[in-house]
Interface confidence: medium
């Protein structure tokens, strides 16, 4: 069956300077390939976090994704700023051998509202 990506929250509200968790789970780790988080859609979408080892300031994974059969790809964003507002998508990719990774499934999106402190 096709992998399913679920973001249960439609939206989260967070005060500027605080941290927030964006939840995402998948039903399968197959096909092999990374999970990435983006803000926005289309041409304007911005990579926020990738579960591939790179360092992303202010963002870290919530659970230990190195553990076997971990299906939780939630992230925590620290020290939230007004610029962090927007809709965040958790996206599953299939790894390409020579060609780029292929996006195969996206969560429904979670809108982040940033409130003034």
């Amino acid at each position: 069956t096709e992998v399913k990506v679920t973001q249960p929250e439609k939206s989260v509200s967070v005060a500027a300077g605080d941290s927030t968790i964006l939840n995402c789970t998948v039903t399968s780790l197959l096909p092999v390939g990374p999970i990435r988080w983006y803000r926005g859609v289309g041409q304007s979408r911005l990579l926020i976090y990738s579960f591939t080892g790179e360092h992303f300031p202010r963002i870290r994974n919530v659970s230990d994704t190195t553990k076997r059969n971990n299906m939780d790809f939630s992230i925590r964003i620290s020290n939230v700023t007004p610029e962090d507002a927007g809709t965040y998508y958790c996206v599953k990719f299939q790894r390409g051998s020579s060609e780029p990774d292929t996006e195969i499934q996206s969560g429904g999106g979670t809108e982040v509202y940033v409130l003034a402190k």
Epitope: T6, P8, E9, K10, S11, V12, T25, G108
Partner: antibody, heavy 119, light 108 residues
């Protein structure tokens, strides 16, 4: 106080159409996703359809897909359900339900309107 | 589609007794589960969300517990107004949103 008032129910023959309305008050209607949920006589609750606050996102249960159309008019604070090609199994009380702003559970419900499909 | 199975179908109890209602999910819904009460001729009423959080105005004799696939709604001491049908609903999965088949709590 949140109020949801359904109307438009009645007796209709199989194959015919009916349009239900739900008038909302007491909250910022355009900021909330709203749903139709139905209950056939002696049966449990069955989710029918949902529409996002802006009207851009719409989902239907498989049992009504292609026959029912959900819509909303935010200027009138009203939700609609256009029901075409009605069947006997569509006989139910139809509830309008307002979703929580963060999750897809229902924190406010209307009293319901009865739709009876019978020849 | 996530299937919710409620048991028992009917619970016959006396006022003052404790009621324990069960809801089982076909796959994990974490704690994304709500409980509703429905009385004849009335709109359903939200009781519990997040598996264990009471909705506004709900008396503390109602409590919810569980996570993953097993959930329980407990009414610690049944009052006359508590005799009704109770439904669970998952909101973890994107639509279709699904309800359990309901448990009727009736007077013994």
């Amino acid at each position: 106080e949140v109020q949801l008032v359904e109307s438009g129910g009645g007796v209709v023959q199989p194959g015919r159409s009916l349009r239900l309305s739900c008038a909302a008050s007491g909250f910022t209607f355009s900021s909330y996703d709203v749903n139709w949920v139905r209950q056939a006589p002696g049966k449990g609750l069955e989710w029918v359809s949902l529409i996002s606050g802006s009207g851009e996102i719409i989902y239907y249960a498989d049992s009504v897909k292609g026959r029912f159309t959900i819509s909303r008019d935010n200027s009138k604070n009203t939700l609609y359900l256009q029901m075409n090609s009605l069947r006997a199994e569509d006989t139910a009380v139809y509830y309008c339900a307002k979703e929580n702003n963060r999750y897809r559970f229902f924190d406010d419900w209307g009293q319901g309107t009865l739709v009876t499909v019978s020849s | 589609e996530i299937v919710l199975t409620q048991s028992p179908g009917t619970l016959s109890l006396s006022p003052g007794e404790r009621a324990t209602l069960s809801c089982r999910a076909s796959q994990s819904v974490y704690t994304y589960l709500a409980w509703y009460q429905e009385k004849p001729g009335q709109a359903p009423r939200l009781l519990i969300y997040g598996a264990s959080s009471r909705a506004t105005g709900i008396p503390d004799r109602f409590s919810g517990s569980g996570s993953g696939t097993e959930f329980t709604l407990t009414i610690s001491s049944l009052q006359s107004e508590d005799f009704a049908v109770y439904y669970c609903q998952q909101y973890y999965d994107r639509p279709p949103l699904t309800f359990g088949g309901g448990t009727k709590v009736e007077i013994k």
